[in-house]
Interface confidence: low
C-alpha cells in the first residue's frame, strides 16, 4: 500500500485547515492508528494528535480543541485530521505515521501554509500646490505572509517607488506615488491596489487628489461699453476665476469707496440704475489658502444728454 | 502621533464581570493586531490574548479562555477587553497593546487598574 | 507550555555594564523582544527581534539570542535605566504570547 497527502496545504488565517492522509492499501489491510506530529526543524517533533482504530482520537494537550477528524462518513483507512482557525505559528510541516496491519508503518510529510491576508493603509502625502516639483501623493502599506503585492490605479502621471520590510513572520510593503501637481489632476481618485493569495479579490483603497491653485482673474460685463448709460438698469460685473479650494471674491473701488446701492453678491457686483457717480475703477480680489489674484476693470458711464449737448454744441459752432 | 486611551479605574464585586476600552488613535486602526496584558500589583505581565481590529477574529491565553471577550468597534477605532466571573486575583492593571502581527507590542495604553474586592 | 526564566534582580554601579538573561528551551530558534517598566508606567519596548532598537531607544541598549539564552545588555548603565524588565516571546506551539517573569535593574550608589 502507499500514503497519499498533499505536498502543501494553503490556508488564509482563521480557517480550518484540512491535513490529508489516506491510506491506499491491499484488501484486507487495515490501519490500526495515525499519528500526527509537528516536525519542524529546529523545533522538534511534536505530538499532534492520535487517532486509533478503537478509540478514536487523542489530541495533545497544546492543541486541545483545535483538532477534530472531518465529520462523517469516515473510511477506515483515512487518517486526515481538521486542525481549526489556523494561525500564523500553524505554519510549518507535518507528519502522518501510519502504523497498519499487516503491511507495517508508513510515513508521509506534508507542509501547511497559513496566509496573513494584509490589512492595507494610504496615507496622503503633503499638501499639493500648483507649481510644486515632484510631490508625494500618496503612501500605501500593507503588512501580510507572504509579502503582498501594492501597486496603484490611476489615470493621473507619476512615478512610483516600493521598498519592503521583513519582520519576523511577514513582510511590510510600502508604496509611494509622487506627481508634479497640476490642476487638471484635481479630482482625479488614486487608487491603490493590494494583491495576495489570502485575498479573494483585490483590496482597493481610493484617494482623490487636491491640488491647490489659483487662476487668474478677469472682469466679465464691459463687453459693451455702449451698454453703460445712464438710466439703465441690471447692470453687473462679474469677476471669473477658479481655485482649490474654492476662492472667495472681495470688490472694491480704487478711486473711492464703492457708490452706495451697489451690491457685492459673492463674485458679482450689482449696480442700481447707472449714475455718472457709478464711473470709476473697480478691483475684484479673489483669494484662497494658496493665493490671491486682482483684476481691475475701469467704468465709464456715459450720459446722453451729456452726449447731445456736445452735438448740439458742435453744430451751432459750425 | 499614535495613541491608546484606555478608560479610567473600576471597582467590582467577585462573580462580577468588567469592559474596559481602549480608543486608539494617530494610526490606521484597522492596520494593526491589539492585544491585552494584565499586570497584577507587584507581579509581572501576563498575556490576555488578541484582536483583529480589520475581521474581529480573536485568539485568547488558554488561561482566560471562556472569561474573556475582545470586541472592536472600527466605527470609533476602539477595542474592548471584557472578562467575567470576576475574583479577587483578577485585581490588576489591564493594558492594551498595540502589535505586529502577534510579535512585539511597540505601543501601550496607560493602563486601567481593576479592583476586585466585597 | 513554553516558560521563559529570568533572574530577579541585577545589580550595576553607573557607567558599567548591565546584563540581564532570559532562559528558555531553544529560545535561539524565537524572537525576543525586551520592556522597559519604570513603577506606575506601562512598558516601553526597548529591543525588539532579538537585537533591533525602536526609534528613540539610545544606542546602549542591545540584545542577543542563541542556544538557550536571551541577553539584554545596557552599556554605560544611568540612574534612569533603574526599572523592572521584561523578556518576551512568541511561542508557536501554543499560539500565546509569553513574558519572562522580570529583572529588576537597580543602580547603585
Known amino acids: 500500500g502507499e500514503l497519499e497527502t498533499s505536498d502543501v496545504v494553503t490556508v488564509v488565517l482563521g480557517q480550518d485547515a484540512k491535513l490529508p492522509c489516506f491510506y491506499r492499501g491491499d484488501s484486507g489491510e487495515q490501519v490500526g492508528q495515525v499519528a500526527w506530529a509537528r516536525a519542524d526543524a529546529g523545533e522538534g517533533a511534536q505530538e499532534l494528535a492520535l487517532l486509533h482504530s478503537k478509540y478514536g482520537l487523542h489530541v495533545s494537550p497544546a492543541y486541545e480543541g483545535r483538532v477534530e477528524q472531518p465529520p462523517p462518513p469516515r473510511n477506515p483507512l483515512d487518517g486526515s485530521v481538521l486542525l481549526r482557525n489556523a494561525v500564523q505559528a500553524d505554519e510549518g510541516e507535518y507528519e502522518c505515521r501510519v502504523s497498519t496491519f499487516p503491511a507495517g508503518s508508513f510515513q508521509a510529510r506534508l507542509r501547511l501554509r497559513v496566509l496573513v491576508p494584509p490589512l492595507p493603509s494610504l496615507n496622503p502625502g503633503p499638501a499639493l500646490e500648483e507649481g510644486q516639483g515632484l510631490t508625494l501623493a500618496a503612501s500605501c502599506t500593507a503588512e501580510g505572509s507572504p509579502a503582498p503585492s501594492v501597486t496603484w490605479d490611476t489615470e493621473v502621471k507619476g512615478t512610483t517607488s516600493s521598498r519592503s520590510f521583513k519582520h519576523s513572520r511577514s513582510a511590510a510593503v510600502t508604496s509611494e506615488f509622487h506627481l508634479v501637481p497640476s490642476r487638471s489632476m484635481n479630482g482625479q481618485p488614486l487608487t491603490c491596489v493590494v494583491s495576495h493569495p489570502g485575498l479573494l479579490q483585490d483590496q482597493r483603497i481610493t484617494h482623490i487628489l487636491h491640488v491647490s491653485f489659483l487662476a487668474e482673474a478677469s472682469v466679465r460685463g464691459l463687453e459693451d461699453q455702449n451698454l453703460w448709460h445712464v438710466g439703465r438698469e441690471g447692470a453687473m460685473l462679474k469677476c471669473l476665476s477658479e481655485g482649490q479650494p474654492p476662492p472667495s471674491y472681495n470688490w472694491t473701488r480704487l478711486d473711492g469707496p464703492l457708490p452706495s446701492g451697489v451690491r457685492v453678491d459673492g463674485d458679482t457686483l450689482g449696480f442700481p440704475p447707472l449714475t455718472t457717480e457709478h464711473s470709476g475703477i473697480y478691483v475684484c480680489h479673489v483669494s484662497n489658502e494658496f493665493s490671491s489674484r486682482d483684476s481691475q476693470v475701469t467704468v465709464d458711464v456715459l450720459d446722453p444728454q451729456e452726449d447731445s449737448g456736445k452735438q448740439v454744441d458742435l453744430v451751432s459752432a459750425s | 502621533q499614535v495613541q491608546l486611551v484606555q478608560s479610567g479605574a473600576e471597582v467590582k464585586k467577585p462573580g462580577a464581570s468588567v469592559k474596559v476600552s481602549c480608543k486608539a488613535s494617530?494610526?490606521?486602526?484597522?492596520?494593526?493586531?491589539m492585544h491585552w496584558v494584565r499586570q497584577a500589583p507587584g507581579q509581572g505581565l501576563e498575556w490576555m490574548g488578541i484582536?483583529?481590529?480589520?475581521?474581529?477574529?480573536?485568539t485568547y491565553a488558554q488561561k482566560f479562555q471562556g472569561r474573556v471577550t475582545m470586541t472592536r468597534d472600527t466605527s470609533t477605532s476602539t477595542v474592548y477587553m471584557e472578562l467575567s466571573s470576576l475574583r479577587s486575583e483578577d485585581t490588576a492593571v489591564y493594558y492594551c497593546?498595540?502589535?505586529?502581527?502577534?510579535?512585539?507590542?511597540?505601543?501601550w495604553g496607560q493602563g486601567t487598574l481593576v479592583t476586585v474586592s466585597s | 507550555s513554553y516558560v521563559l526564566t529570568q533572574p530577579p534582580s541585577v545589580s550595576v554601579a553607573p557607567g558599567q555594564t548591565a546584563r540581564i538573561t532570559c532562559g528558555g528551551n531553544?529560545?535561539?530558534?524565537?524572537?525576543v523582544h525586551w520592556y522597559q517598566q519604570k513603577p506606575g508606567q506601562a512598558p516601553v519596548l526597548v529591543v525588539y527581534?532579538?537585537?533591533d532598537r525602536p526609534s528613540g531607544i539610545p544606542e546602549r541598549f542591545s540584545g542577543s539570542n542563541s542556544g538557550n539564552t536571551a541577553t539584554l545588555t545596557i552599556s554605560r548603565v544611568e540612574a534612569g535605566d533603574e526599572a523592572d524588565y521584561y523578556c518576551?516571546?512568541?511561542?508557536?506551539?501554543?499560539?500565546?504570547?509569553?513574558f519572562g517573569g522580570g529583572t529588576k535593574l537597580t543602580v547603585l550608589g
Open positions: 497593546a498595540r502589535g505586529r502581527l502577534g510579535t512585539y507590542f511597540d505601543y
Open positions: 494617530g494610526y490606521t486602526f484597522t492596520g494593526y493586531y
Open positions: 484582536i483583529n481590529p480589520s475581521g474581529g477574529s480573536t
Open positions: 531553544n529560545i535561539g530558534s524565537k524572537s
Open positions: 527581534d532579538d537585537s
Open positions: 518576551q516571546v512568541w511561542d508557536r506551539s501554543s499560539d500565546q504570547v509569553v
